[in-house]
């Protein structure tokens, strides 16, 4: 392992929202774990990076991810509210020059090496739908979230507000 040591009904026109400026409003390192306290880890295998969801052994160090938060402006004519709205979008980078990407065709979450400006597939709308947990919704595919499937990260379609609290799309961030 290595480190650097809504829903369609609720989400409209995400792909049209403009990210305010090109600089993140804040960045920090955190470990990512599931609702059930399994760790998200990253490993180099056959010259590509794999993402795993696993129980760590006692005292095993958690991988850290650089979370970069961006503000995204929603003009009032798109928001449906009659007011300009703002969202938080996040990119996740577990090591230099690599970012989590949504592969909507394969319904998978992958690590890709890329340069800035990052493609839309690397941006996720941040939700906190549950106490002290967050969810990551694809900017490119509203209603699709990063989730856990068979000990891997995958893209999961959430089709109703009731499912926004499904445990497999909830993650915890920890800076310790």
């Amino acid at each position: 392992a290595f480190g650097i040591s809504g829903v369609q009904k609720y989400t409209r026109a995400l792909h049209d929202s403009s990210i305010t400026g090109i600089s993140p409003i804040t960045e920090y390192l955190a470990s990512l774990s599931t609702y059930n306290d399994q760790s998200i880890t990253f490993a180099l295998e056959d010259e590509s990076y794999e993402i795993y969801v696993e129980d760590l052994k006692k005292d095993e160090k958690k991988d850290k991810v650089l979370l970069s938060y961006y503000e995204s402006q929603h003009p009032s004519n798109e928001s449906g509210d009659g007011v300009d709205g703002k969202m938080l979008m996040v990119t996740l980078s577990p090591t230099k020059d690599f970012w989590l990407h949504a592969n909507n065709k394969e319904h998978s979450v992958e690590l890709h090496k890329c340069e800035k400006p990052l493609p839309d597939q690397a941006f996720f709308v941040l939700h906190n739908m549950h106490s002290n947990c967050v969810s990551f919704e694809c900017k490119t595919d509203p209603g699709v979230f990063i989730g856990v499937k068979d000990n891997h990260l995958a893209l999961i379609k959430v089709d109703s507000s009731e499912n926004l609290c499904t445990e497999n799309i909830l993650f915890k961030l920890s800076e310790t």
Epitope: D81, L88, N132, S161, L164
Partner: antibody, heavy 121, light 107 residues
Amino acid sequence: QVHLKESGPGLVAPSQSLSITCNVSGFSLSKYGVHWIRQTPGRGLDWLGVLRAGGTISYNSALMSRLSISEDISKSQVFLKMNDLQTDDSAIYFCARDHYYYSSFGGFASWGQGTLVTVSA
Amino acid sequence: DIQMTQSPASQSASLGESVTITCLASQTIATWLAWYQQKPGKSPQLLIYAATRLADGVPSRFSGSGSGTEFSFKISSLQAEDFVIYYCQQLYNTPYTFGGGTKLEIK
């Protein structure tokens, strides 16, 4: 124009329950969380709970057994119910809207005017 | 729960001066901190969010800094209407706790 307005009973007898309505306009409850906060001269500002976009609810665990938050999306209303009120629950009760869609990380951008609740026999 | 310790509880200053208020979190809160202003008989108003970001319509004489557990809020060139109460609030974890407030008084 974003607007939130609380309406409450004013006076509540000890051991009785409190019901407050927050009427909202200018934004959608399906995009923004609405929080309940109360303020007393002695304790300052206390966060009570939130009805998040999508309908999930988080409470302050210290008051969780006495609190209930709900909504009527069709009427753009959020409700706070609190049971077994005591004199130290006397406070101004506010509802407030998240700054960001779907997330509370940006603080509370719009607040209601507040409603004064006095618990007294 | 995360405790927010705000200091000073009150401060006297003159028009045109600068003042700084600090807020200490009992554990790391990244940059998820907001500052509010409350005028007498009114509800709090968001001034700063995400520790450093100025809310819409807020004058540039207000600024915020810090991350982790230590945060500062500065008002440069105090105006008459600034002599009110200011609160910090952490948005990192529920319950979203507030500092005890700082009352700015005119000297």
